[in-house]
Each structure stands twice: as C-alpha cells, then as structure tokens.
Interface confidence: medium
C-alpha cells in the first residue's frame, strides 16, 4: 500500500522510505476524534513533508494534519467512520506515498487509569480495580484489558491476565509472601473496532503480607 515518488523533480525524495503508520482515537476529546501518524524510519527528513487524509470524511473532501515535532496529528469531528480513507505523505501537491485505511481498524484506546489493589484479609486475595474512559463512549465501548504484574525484583517476568471487565481477583497463594509487586493495565478494542494496545496505565505498587508461621498463611 505504500509507494514512492516517480517525478524527476523529486529525485532526493525517491531515495527515502516514507513508510508510515497511524492510529485513531475516537471521542478522545468529547465528540472529537484524533488521528496520529508517524514515519517508521525515525531518520526521515520531515522538512516540507505533509500528511493529508481524503475520503470517508464529513462535509469536507480532505483534511491536512498538524505537525507536532516528529508526529502528524488531526483532531476533528469529521471522520465518517465508514469505509476507507486515503492517507498520503505529500511534498507540496505531489504525493510520495499513500495508504488506504479504515479508521475503525486502527483504533488505539486511551490508557486505563485509577488502577488500585486492595488486600482482603478474610478472603486471602487481592482485588485489582481500574477505570477506563471508554465506558462512557458511544463508539469504542467494548475493550479487552491486559493486566500485567511482576515481582519488583523480576525485571522481565511479567504475568499477564486478559479480561473484559475492570475488576480482577488475584489469589494470595499465587503470589510470593512479603514481596513488592508492580501491576499495570492496558486495553485493546474488542468487538466491532480493531486496532492496537493502548499505552500502559501508570503502575501501581503493592506489598504482599508475610507468612503467618502458625497457619502457613500470609499476614
């Protein structure tokens, strides 16, 4: 779906790889949607390069992106959310490369927030809860969440749990006693919309109780 400049007056441009990727965020600011694109090669000289989206828009034929450092960005209510849009990298009026993209298939949800863990002594478990702004949205309401947790000393040994609700119970016996744990959560569209994992929520840290020697249980 990507192509390269064919014009003689764009010889320098022909040498570059203008591959890019994009993600959409629906109702990210009230009823406004956003679309963010960036070049896959971080060394691309973006001077004079512009992004434009055409088709599957409301009331207008095309929209130009704003440039924010190395990313290109649109915030608008004008995404039709039906069919494919044509997103092009341009120099002036000349298109260097284009992709046809359905914005409903590149949705990146907003990161979950308010992650917390509560220890229930009587139940010998930890109740993990978090919140997501998507519960209030019209479009991307149904998400799959990925809760990841690890013992703080085990840098890369993350345990992942997938769930559709915003509440998870971790059994005390599955965790090490008297240990500090880090936990975080991210979301991905599930159901009609498709796309990418959100950013991770801020991490939450909690400590497991020590083992009670008389009962073999944690304190």
């Amino acid at each position: 779906e990507s192509g390269y400049a064919q014009n003689g007056d764009l010889e320098d441009a022909e040498l570059d790889d203008y591959s890019f990727s994009c993600y959409s965020q629906l109702e990210v600011n009230g009823s406004q949607h956003s679309l963010t694109c960036a070049f896959e090669d971080p060394d691309v000289n973006t001077t004079n390069l512009e992004f434009e989206i055409c088709g599957a828009l409301v009331e207008v034929k095309c929209l130009n992106f704003r440039k924010l450092q190395e990313i290109y960005f649109i915030e608008t209510k004008k995404f039709l959310l039906i069919g494919k849009s044509n997103i092009c990298v341009k120099v002036g009026e000349k298109s260097l490369t284009c992709k046809k993209i359905d914005l409903t298939t590149i949705v990146k949800p907003e990161a979950p927030f308010d992650l917390s863990v509560i220890y229930r002594e009587g139940a010998n478990d930890f109740v993990v809860t978090f919140n997501t702004s998507h519960l209030q949205k019209k479009y991307v309401k149904v998400l799959m969440h990925d809760v990841a947790y690890r013992q703080e000393k085990d840098e890369n040994k993350w345990t992942h749990v997938n769930l559709s609700s915003t509440k998870l119970t971790l059994l005390q016996r599955k965790l090490q006693p008297a240990a500090m744990y880090e936990i975080k959560v991210r979301s991905i569209p599930d159901h009609y919309f498709k796309g990418f994992w959100s950013e991770w929520s801020p991490s939450y840290y909690f400590r497991t109780p020590e083992i009670n020697n008389s009962s073999g249980e944690m304190d």
């Epitope: 055409c54 828009l57 409301v58 009331e59 959310l81 039906i82 069919g83 409903t104």
Partner: antibody, heavy 121, light 109 residues
Framework: EVQLVESGGGLVQPGRSLRLSCAAS????????MHWVRQAPGKGLEWVSG????????GYADSVKGRFTIFRDNAKNSLYLQMNSLRAEDTALYYC??????????????WGQGTTVTVSS | AIQLTQSPSSLSASVGDRVTITCRAS??????LAWYQQKPGKAPKLLIY???SLESGVPSRFSGSGSGTDFTLTISSLQPEDFATYYC???????????FGQGTRLEIK
C-alpha cells in the same frame, strides 16, 4: 464501466426462502460498503440492509431483521441477500447499490436495475 | 431511527417553472442528506449529496440547500425530462442505517 447486476428474484410462496445476488464490476469492490434497497409496486424506496467493505458493519431495516441476512464475497465481487420466512409484504423490486463515502456523507451513487421478488401462494 | 418527511407528496408544474421540494428530518443530521431522482421503470439516480453538492453529470438547474433538520431541492427551470419522483435520503454510520423520505412525485401540469 461501473456496473451492478442483480439476480435470483422470482415467485416464491410465503414462508419460503430466496437468495438474491449482485455481481459488481468496474470498481474496487472491497473498498465500498454495499446495500440492498427495495421498492414495492407503486411505493417508495425502502432501505433493506447494508454491509461495510469488510463485513464487520452490518445493518437491517426493522421490517426484515431476523429474517434476512446480508453477506458479501470480496473475492468474487459479489453481494448477497438471503431472505428467509418470506411474507407477502416482501414483494418488491430489489436493488443492489454501491456507497460512495469519498464524497463525504454516505450516498448511493451506483444502482443496479433490480430483480423482482414476488411472494404469493 | 431518524424519520424523513418530504413535502409535498406530489405536485404539478409546467416546463420552465421553478420547483422546490422540502425534506424535514425528525432530528438534526448536519448536512448528511442526499437527493435522488427516479423515473418510472428505472433505478434511482443520485443528484445531490452533502445536502448541497451536485453529483457529476447532473445539470446545474438542480440545487440543494439546508442543514440540521430542514432541506430543500430546487429545480430552477423545469425541463421535460425532470418529471419524475424525487427522494431524500439520510444515513447513520454506527450502527449502519439508511432512511429514505416517502418521495415527491413531480407531474406535468
């Protein structure tokens, strides 16, 4: 030339089934949502069903929900309407239509000539 | 679902007349409206999209206007080939849904 050709209509008894087909040519079929619209004799246009380019977005008129199924085969450039539990009020000329979202709002810019469905005992 | 009501249901006019057909939506639809022309025994033909944009190949005597709930189709100077039935159409993108007005039959006086 952009063209849509419907087929599969005919005379059918109430309660029976029929499958309509629409063969598309002259455009990139899998870039476009497609629709079925019907017109009963001497009546106005009634939207029946629509399907997005990738079949993930599907809608039905209340009058056919649960009885009709729309589906498409992008490899064959074809749109279908499976009509079950047919009723006398389903008697109509059935049109296949292509959307043209690139004009902004959703519009039906190409229509077939229609295929006639008659439900009668 | 949003309802579209066209008026009048039918009207008689003469060649050269200026004719206006209205379409009222039961709720605001911005400019999400299209107009079609249908002649007897033929498939509908797109005339206007985005409430006011003229489809390629459609004569400039056809024009559309309006936004929100009230829309009009105007034929500035009727020609013999314009006698037909006209429909307005609205859409909803999620869930997928299309609504047509009941039609306005334009006859020769």
């Amino acid at each position: 030339e952009v063209q849509l050709v419907e087929s599969g209509g005919g005379l059918v008894q109430p309660g029976r089934s029929l499958r309509l087909s629409c063969a598309a040519s002259g455009f990139t079929f899998d870039d476009h949502a497609m629709h079925w619209v019907r017109q009963a004799p001497g009546k106005g246009l009634e939207w029946v069903s629509g399907i997005s380019w990738n079949s993930r977005g599907i809608g039905y008129a209340d009058s056919v929900k649960g009885r009709f199924t729309i589906f498409r085969d992008n490899a064959k450039n074809s749109l279908y309407l499976q009509m079950n539990s047919l009723r006398a009020e389903d008697t109509a000329l059935y049109y296949c239509a292509k959307d043209e979202y690139s004009r902004g709002y959703y519009v039906l810019d190409v229509w077939g000539q229609g295929t006639t469905v008659t439900v009668s005992s | 679902a949003i309802q579209l009501t066209q008026s009048p249901s039918s009207l008689s006019a003469s060649v050269g007349d200026r004719v206006t057909i209205t379409c009222r939506a039961s709720a605001g639809i911005s400019s999400a409206l299209a107009w079609y022309q249908q002649k007897p025994g033929k498939a509908p033909k797109l005339l206007i999209y985005d409430a006011s944009s003229l489809e390629s190949g459609v004569p400039s005597r056809f024009s559309g206007s309006g936004s929100g709930t009230d829309f009009t189709l105007t034929i500035s100077s009727l020609q013999p080939e314009d006698f037909a039935t006209y429909y307005c159409q609205q859409f909803n993108s999620y869930p997928l849904w299309i609504t047509f007005g009941q039609g306005t039959r334009l006859e020769i006086k």
